[in-house]
């Protein structure tokens, strides 16, 4: 078969639309991303062009390998939609739209503790809040570096709450919480809060 197709052949499935993709769909502002424009036909010399809406962002030639376009997402309007054009001679086809989801990273959460002390038990309420970051935010509470709660998803800006009751401990316990949202590999932790042992009147968080 000829390596060059005419426009009639292009209208059939012999030259399908290119595929536009990225390794990540969820990004934060200022993040560098790579977009891959590829085609099933590995024998043709194809000219790939990337567009955001109607703005031409770049052109690359390729044969058998995807074209890689490196971008930086700095503003909300740069989330997309993106299209890739594959062109052979004077004939071209476009990919489906691709858009990034821009997510603000979570800031370090703040952990607050309230304790109701009885003779035998401590009723502990933990509150965790990250004041910034795209929703939903998933909060997890830890005691001595071990998770003590499931992930608590918050779809608003109020703190996550977790209650537990413990027999009065004889040693210190350290609490902290984790906040993360849909940004991959991006989680933040609160400063640890240490609950002293029950010796004496050393319970600064306690409501007697």
């Amino acid at each position: 078969r000829k390596a060059v197709l005419d426009c009639e052949a292009m209208k059939t499935n012999e030259f399908p639309s290119p595929c536009l993709d990225s390794k990540t769909k969820v990004v934060m502002k200022g993040q560098n991303v790579s977009m891959f424009c590829s085609h099933k036909n590995k024998s043709l010399q194809i000219t790939y062009s990337l567009f955001r809406r109607k703005t031409h962002l770049g052109t690359q030639d390729g044969k058998g390998e995807p074209a890689i376009f490196n971008l930086s997402i700095t503003e909300a309007h740069e989330s997309g939609p993106y299209k890739c054009k594959a062109q052979v001679t004077s004939c071209s086809k476009y990919s489906r739209d691709f858009s990034f989801t821009i997510v603000d990273p979570v800031t370090s959460p703040v952990l607050n503790i309230m304790v109701i002390q009885t003779e035998t038990d401590r009723h502990i309420t933990l509150h965790c809040l990250s004041v910034n970051g795209s929703l939903p935010i998933n909060y997890t509470f830890f005691e001595n570096h071990v998770a003590i709660s499931p992930a608590i998803s918050k779809y608003d800006r109020e703190p996550a709450e977790f209650n537990l009751t413990k027999k009065n401990p004889g040693e210190e316990e350290e609490y902290r919480c984790e906040a993360k949202n849909r940004l991959p590999n991006y989680a933040t932790y609160s400063h640890p809060v240490t609950m002293p042992s029950t010796g004496g009147d050393s319970c600064p968080f306690c409501l007697k």
Partner: antibody, heavy 119, light 110 residues
């Protein structure tokens, strides 16, 4: 470009039911919260409820029980099922997408669909 | 639940006037407040989010300020196209909600 198109409004008798649709294009509804807001003639905006990425729903206190929000991901469409309709439910119903995956400002609105409850 | 109270409910002003609309939340909502403009027969349009950030394409004569419970929308020099109804909206809490929106402020021609 993101677009929201409501449909399904019309005249319904008191006690009847109606299902409104909001078809979204240019946006992936699995990442954003979709809201329903209504406006009675000559009145202010009234939030009804929202559906978020995981299909979880939240409602205004007054809407619980009679109103149900659902979603069809394959059609990228959100629905508002309204039951036991009353004259005071007469309003323009808008869908609005937030800028976030939870409670947020509503940066894109549909054109609205009029629901008239009357005998 | 958080109640949003706008004032005034209506005002009359002339082209070129400086106009201020206030919105008060019944409890702190940090800076999670938005402002909308609505013209008759049209859907609302987002003007300002996060209390003070101008939405895309909104003229710079619009500005927002405040945090906690007290917020202000200011139009520095009223234009003919600004005669409309303005709404504030809390974007902070989903707990026990009756409405996200204030009752609206109608800006009319004097």
């Amino acid at each position: 470009e993101v677009q929201l198109v409501e449909s399904g409004g019309g005249l319904v008798q008191p006690g009847g039911s109606l299902r409104l649709s909001c078809a979204a294009s240019g946006i992936d509804l699995s990442y954003y919260a979709m809201n329903w807001v209504r406006q009675a003639p000559g009145k202010g905006l009234e939030w009804i409820g929202m559906i978020v990425g995981g299909g979880i729903t939240f409602y205004a206190n007054w809407a619980k029980g009679r109103f149900t929000i659902s979603r069809d991901n394959s059609k990228n469409t959100v629905y508002l099922q309204m039951n036991s309709l009353r004259a005071e439910d007469t309003a323009v119903y808008y869908c609005a997408v937030g800028s976030d995956g939870g409670i947020s400002d509503f940066n894109i609105w549909g054109q609205g669909t009029l629901v008239t409850v009357s005998s | 639940d958080i109640q949003m109270t706008q004032s005034p409910s209506s005002l009359s002003a002339s082209v070129g006037d400086r106009v201020t609309i206030t919105c008060q939340a019944s409890q702190s909502i940090s800076s999670y407040l938005a402002w909308y403009q609505q013209k008759p027969g049209k859907a609302p349009k987002l003007l300002i989010y996060r209390a003070s950030t101008l939405a895309s394409g909104v003229p710079s004569r619009f500005s927002g300020s405040g945090s906690g419970t007290d917020f202000t929308l200011t139009i520095s020099s009223l234009q003919p196209e600004d005669f409309a109804t303005y709404y504030c909206q809390q974007a902070y809490s989903l707990s026990n909600v009756d409405n996200f929106f204030g009752q609206g402020t109608k800006v009319e021609i004097k």
